[in-house]
């Protein structure tokens, strides 16, 4: 089952997600999506990175940590009740079925 995280209406929510780059700066693509992780990629994408940078994001969603060191934790700004639900963090490690998938449940009070 999903790990549960809580935040209050109007505050920022923090959803942790980490990986260890094979070497400094040797990044892998990561996507964040609203909804449980599907078979591949992320549905309802709110943010994604490639091998170099954040290449897609939507308002209120950002990475506060140093994603170049593998901290791809998601911050959601000024949350509302509509932000409740499951979020997918997917670390897209190259290879055959190597992706790491994390489903995180956000509860807004």
């Amino acid at each position: 089952s999903e790990v549960e995280y809580r935040a209050e209406v109007g505050q920022n929510a923090y959803l942790p997600c980490f990986y260890t780059p094979a070497a400094p700066g040797n990044l892998v693509p990561v996507c964040w999506g609203k909804g449980a992780c599907p078979v591949f990629e992320c549905g309802n994408v709110v943010l994604r990175t490639d091998e170099r940078d954040v290449n897609y994001w939507t308002s209120r969603y950002w990475l506060n940590g140093d994603f170049r060191k593998g901290d791809v934790s998601l911050t959601i700004e000024n949350v509302t009740l509509a932000d409740s639900g499951i979020y997918c963090c997917r670390i897209q490690i190259p290879g055959i079925m190597n992706d790491e998938k994390f489903n995180l449940k956000l509860v807004i009070k």
Epitope: V39, F40, G43
Partner: antibody, heavy 123, light 108 residues
Framework: QVQLVQSGAEVKKPGASVKVSCKAS????????MHWVRQAPGQGLEWMGI????????IYAQKFQGRVTMTRDTSTSTVYMELSSLRSEDTAVYYC????????????????WGQGTTVTVSS | EIVLTQSPGTLSLSPGERATLSCRAS???????LAWYQQKPGQAPRLLIY???SRATGIPDRFSGSGSGTDFTLTISRLEPEDFAVYYC?????????FGQGTRLEIK
């Protein structure tokens, strides 16, 4: 226009392998995932797996793990599906199908299909 | 594995009538991850609906999709002669990707 052209029909003996190709044209090959789906005579659709044509991500259906290999050649915009240890139950039409997830679109759906390759397994 | 059960297996209707096809999932599927396809004899499937309710490019507006959770519906508001075919639902939510067994829509 966007199209997928597959290799021709194959007849194989049980225990043999078959390699089906799927050549893409009309779009940026490395921007879209490619599925392989098969359909036995008179039956429904069965998903076999998916490859990211950049070649860095492959997912196989558990049923086919160990027997299926999906590869790609970006120089010719072609994906391949090889199925080994063939048995009579593998007789089917094999389709490649592009998933339209990508290029800023984050929904899923197999929007372009090859014409299908008939593989017959018979002794 | 998520099992998709389509009903009815065969639907016999006349042109001009309304068709309602059902797809029930063995466990909840996000609506973002559900699609519908049409297949005619000797042809590859054609994407009709993605995200449970969005029409694919070039699909007439007589086709519509709805539903959430475990119950999804494809509706054809007024059947045209070219609509008689087999229809499949499909889910992307959990590996393996699965299809329903199909509903055959035939002319009455």
């Amino acid at each position: 226009q966007v199209q997928l052209v597959q290799s021709g029909a194959e007849v194989k003996k049980p225990g043999a392998s078959v390699k089906v190709s799927c050549k893409a044209s009309g779009y940026t090959f490395t921007s879209y995932y490619m599925h392989w789906v098969r359909q036995a005579p008179g039956q429904g659709l069965e998903w076999m797996g998916i490859i990211n044509p950049r070649g860095d991500s492959i997912i196989y259906a558990q049923k086919f793990q160990g027997r299926v290999t999906m590869t790609r050649d970006t120089s010719t915009s072609t994906v391949y599906m090889e199925l080994s240890s063939l048995r009579s139950e593998d007789t089917a039409v094999y389709y490649c199908a592009r998933d339209f997830y990508g290029s800023g679109n984050y929904y899923y759906g197999m929007d372009v299909w090859g014409q299908g390759t008939t593989v017959t397994v018979s002794s | 594995e998520i099992v998709l059960t389509q009903s009815p297996g065969t639907l016999s209707l006349s042109p001009g009538e309304r068709a309602t096809l059902s797809c029930r999932a063995s466990q909840s599927v996000s609506s973002s991850y559900l699609a519908w396809y049409q297949q005619k004899p000797g042809q590859a499937p054609r994407l009709l609906i993605y995200g449970a309710s969005s029409r694919a490019t070039g699909i007439p507006d007589r086709f519509s999709g709805s539903g959430s959770g475990t119950d999804f519906t494809l509706t054809i508001s007024r059947l045209e002669p070219e609509d008689f075919a087999v229809y499949y639902c499909q889910q992307y939510g959990s590996s393996p990707i699965t299809f329903g067994q199909g509903t055959r829509l035939e002319i009455k």
